[in-house]
């Protein structure tokens, strides 16, 4: 799995979308989990409704919400009031029994508010990151930015 980078501004909301094949994953609940370490399991943050037919209902855990468009095949995760501690590596998962298939690996980046939290010399400008030369970057901020395709370093 390549990793998609989603960038949001601290204090604002960030929406992460995970597209999937609606027929292949028919009847399956979904989950959003976080990779805390280089190794070890992905720790569940929030999952869709226990009744698959009610997956469209938004479920919250703290400031993180999940909702699933099972017909359109799009899982949407909302991180409200984004904070630096939200930055990290996540996965969208499709659940079946005790197993979980990875739908998408997501790197969440929390950008400091350029007006409040950075030195003038540290202002962030859209562009390609050195570490992720060809990664796919989705900018969930209030202006449209350039996108580029990038491969993610291998993860365990």
């Amino acid at each position: 799995h390549n990793t998609t980078v989603f960038q949001g501004v601290a204090g604002q909301s960030l929406q992460v979308s995970c597209p999937y094949d609606s027929m292949k994953h028919w009847g399956r609940r979904k989950a959003w989990c976080r990779q805390l370490g280089e190794k070890g399991p992905c720790q569940r943050v929030v999952s869709t409704h226990n009744l698959w037919l009610l997956s469209f209902l938004r479920r919250w855990n703290g400031s993180t919400a999940i909702t699933d468009d099972t017909l359109g095949g799009t899982l949407t995760i909302t991180l409200r009031n984004l904070q630096p501690h939200d930055a990290g590596l996540y996965q969208c998962q499709s659940l079946h029994g005790s197993e979980a298939d990875t739908l998408r690996k997501v790197l969440v980046e929390v950008l400091a508010d350029p007006l409040d939290h950075r030195d003038a010399g540290d202002l962030w400008f859209p562009g390609e990151s050195e570490s992720f030369e060809d990664a796919h970057v989705e900018h969930s901020i209030s202006r449209s930015l350039l996108e580029g395709e990038i491969p993610f370093p291998p993860t365990s």
Epitope: A10, R34, L36, H85, A87, G88, S129
Partner: antibody, heavy 122, light 107 residues
């Protein structure tokens, strides 16, 4: 195992500059956010700054904003803190610490280096 | 900034005692709290993260609880190695502030 070793501390006059370094080993340095934390003699802990895994995103404590700059060189597995316009109140042991979460930025600190003492005095 | 208030500032206890340290946040921080132990001349060491998760390698006599604004660190049976200063830290804002510390000393 994970090791963080700070260097560059010493005695410096008010208004002068100093650059601290933190050499990292035992983990994938380029995959973790890194922090600087300080502790004035006999006092508590104060977070100073954090930098993201790739150096593109930085946050600072209000007390050092505009004077200190955090940076990193992933090819050298080294974290830096450039301290300008130093004041007597910047006197402290400076610790570097690894963010506790893979590709994280604002989480718990684990582990910490042994610290380097910066004394600002005329 | 979110203010963290730790109490007591000093605590005298004996080996085998059950010890509880409290940390209060000036506003809700959910479970975004960590606890550290620091011995004189040494760097702090992580004990607890996300309010109640025990760091790998930390003895099970340490436990953390609480959410929102009230948190506690409990040492179920104090050992000689536990005499140290303990700090809480909130991680719910741009500036991750620490409590003032609690020194656990021998009674």
């Amino acid at each position: 195992q994970v090791q963080l070793v700070e260097s560059g501390g010493g005695v410096v006059q008010p208004g002068r500059s100093l650059r601290l370094s933190c050499a990292a080993s035992g983990f994938t340095f380029s995959s973790y956010g890194m922090h600087w934390v300080r502790q004035a003699p006999g006092k508590g802990l104060e977070w100073v700054a954090v930098i993201s895994y790739d150096g593109s995103n930085k946050y600072y404590a209000d007390s050092v904003k505009g004077r200190f700059t955090i940076s990193r060189d992933n090819s050298k597995n080294t974290l830096y803190l450039q301290m300008n316009s130093l004041r007597a109140e910047d006197t402290a042991v400076y610790y570097c610490a690894k963010d506790g979460v893979y590709y994280g930025l604002g989480n718990w600190f684990d582990p910490w280096g042994q610290g380097t003492l910066v004394t600002v005095s005329s | 900034d979110i203010q963290m208030t730790q109490s007591p500032s000093t605590l005298s206890a004996s080996v085998g005692d059950r010890v509880t340290i409290t940390c209060r946040a000036s506003q809700s921080i959910s479970s975004w709290l960590a606890w550290y132990q620091q011995k004189p001349g040494k760097a702090p060491k992580l004990l607890i993260y996300k309010a109640s998760s025990l760091e790998s390698g930390v003895p099970s006599r340490f436990s953390g609880s609480g959410s929102g604004t009230e948190f506690t660190l409990t040492i179920s049976s104090l050992q000689p190695d536990d005499f140290a200063t303990y700090y809480c830290q909130q991680l719910n804002s741009y500036s991750p502030t620490f409590g003032g510390g609690t020194k656990v000393e021998i009674k």
